[in-house]
């Protein structure tokens, strides 16, 4: 009669929960029975992220920190049982948490956005074209930002207008601007439940132009046009 | 026989800490899980936490977390909890049981108690 | 956590009289995992009933456990002077486990 190593009940077991779960809160289970009628203790291995905790006598799991989707979902770790009250022999199985999506992330602008520049003087109102992105998952269909300028102030010299759901298009509402940089505030909301709203800022450059670029002295370098 | 031997009454401050021992005999301490359950005659029986002697896995009742450290020293056979910041409500018997190696999940055997009294 | 409701809180009975307690699960429990302890004034638990029916090592015969799901009980076919004390239920079903607020048995 040999003694035998506990056996899992499923090779992987798998779990679904929201990311935004309370700490504490039991997110799954895994189970396994010793063929010589021994208890069992569980354990985790390969918790990287530490975000969980197994009951070693029920193989009850419960989250112990925040969880996250957009670090990576499924979450994998493996279960360890061992036997109890005899050699010690173990098992490994794997759990797989599937980490439900929640709008947590709100938009942002897609890349970096420095170096806008129009040439002063403008010759006619000019516009420019960006893109927002987030990092939340958008299911069967992309985000749905809206747009529109971050304060009141703004309003007498530009204006923000949808292209489609990511991107948008910048345009100056007359051409009486001055030779320097302007920051112009944009706000971004991506709809979601809840709406998340991102304030971000693109910093416009009214420059004197040689050949396309904005000129500078010796030792500026040139802005490069994006427009 | 099995045996477990608890440590003495303690009557400590509130604030302070306080360690008990439960010293484990007849039968092989690494092979069952030690748990730790409290009594007070407001709140009953309550657990606190268990820990496998055999690899040093625990668990922890979510209301004692941080409250609460379970240690285990195979050399002398002990099994130590530890109970930090107390106050008032942490007056009570405390006391260690043996876990059945068995699935059931019962505790066969239980130490006498450690009371402790937490008064300025 | 499985809240574990015992009835009656106190009870008293005659000697050789028939007790029965019972022992009721906020969510299912099973069989395996109900448990019955004894505890007199001044000494620790006892394991008196594992896994619903079967008593510990030195438990009387007439001690028996029954029960399924949510709803469990204790049963002393004739009361004896020795059987005064309080008795938990107490489930390892799910963590934390938990125990019911006991029954006090007197004899009457």
């Known amino acids: 009669d040999v003694n035998e190593a506990p056996q899992f009940s499923q090779h992987v077991f798998q779990a679904k929960v929201s990311e935004d779960v309370a700490i504490g809160t039991k997110v799954g289970n895994v189970t396994a029975k010793d063929p010589e009628g021994l208890d069992i203790s569980y354990s985790l291995r390969g918790d990287t992220r530490g975000w969980l905790k197994i009951d070693h006598v029920t193989g009850e799991i419960f989250s112990v920190a925040p969880l996250d989707r957009e670090a990576g979902s499924p979450y994998r770790v493996q279960v360890v049982a061992t036997e109890v009250g005899g050699s010690s022999l173990s098992s490994v199985s794997e759990f797989h948490l599937i980490l439900m999506d929640v709008n947590d992330n709100p938009p942002r602008l897609a890349k970096d956005y420095t170096g806008l520049f129009f040439c002063h003087p403008l010759s006619a109102p000019g516009s420019l074209i960006f893109e927002a992105t987030d990092d939340d998952q958008h299911l069967f269909r992309g985000p749905h930002f809206t747009f529109s300028l971050g304060s009141g102030s703004l309003q007498n010299d530009w204006e923000v207008s949808k292209i489609n759901g990511t991107h948008a298009r910048l345009s100056t509402r007359h051409t009486e601007f001055e030779e320097r940089e302007y920051v112009v505030l944009i706000r971004i909301n991506d709809g979601g439940r809840p709406p998340l709203e991102g304030i971000v800022s693109l910093p416009v450059t009214f420059c004197s132009c040689v050949e396309g670029s904005c000129f500078r002295p010796a030792g500026h370098k040139h802005h490069h046009h994006h427009h | 026989q099995v045996q477990l031997q608890q440590s003495g009454a303690e009557l400590v401050k509130p604030g302070a800490s306080v360690r008990m021992s439960c010293k484990s005999s007849?039968?092989?301490?690494?092979?069952?899980?030690i748990h730790w359950v409290r009594q007070t005659p407001g709140q009953g029986l309550e657990w606190i936490g268990a820990i496998y002697p055999g690899n040093g896995d625990n668990s922890y009742n979510q209301k004692f977390r941080g409250k609460v450290t379970l240690t285990a020293d195979k050399s002398s056979s002990t099994a130590y909890m530890q109970l930090n910041s107390l106050t008032s409500e942490d007056s009570a018997v405390y006391y260690c049981a043996r876990q059945t190696a068995r699935t059931t999940r019962a505790m066969d055997y239980w130490g006498q108690g450690t009371t402790v009294t937490v008064s300025s | 956590d499985i809240v574990l409701t015992q009835s009656p809180a106190i009870m008293s009975a005659s000697l050789g009289e028939r007790v029965t307690m019972t022992c009721t699960a906020s969510?299912?429990?099973?069989?395996?995992?109900l448990h019955w302890y004894q505890q007199k004034p001044g000494s620790s638990p006892k394991l008196w009933i594992y896994?619903?029916?079967n008593l510990a090592s030195g438990v009387p015969a007439r001690f028996s456990g029954s029960g399924s799901g949510t709803s469990y009980s204790l049963t002393i076919s004739s009361m004896a002077a020795e059987d005064a004390a309080t008795y938990y239920c107490h489930q390892y079903l799910r963590s934390p486990p938990t125990f019911g607020s006991g029954t006090k048995l007197e004899i009457k």
């Open positions: 007849g039968y092989t301490f690494t092979s069952y899980n």
């Open positions: 969510s299912s429990v099973s069989s395996s995992y």
């Open positions: 896994s619903t029916s």
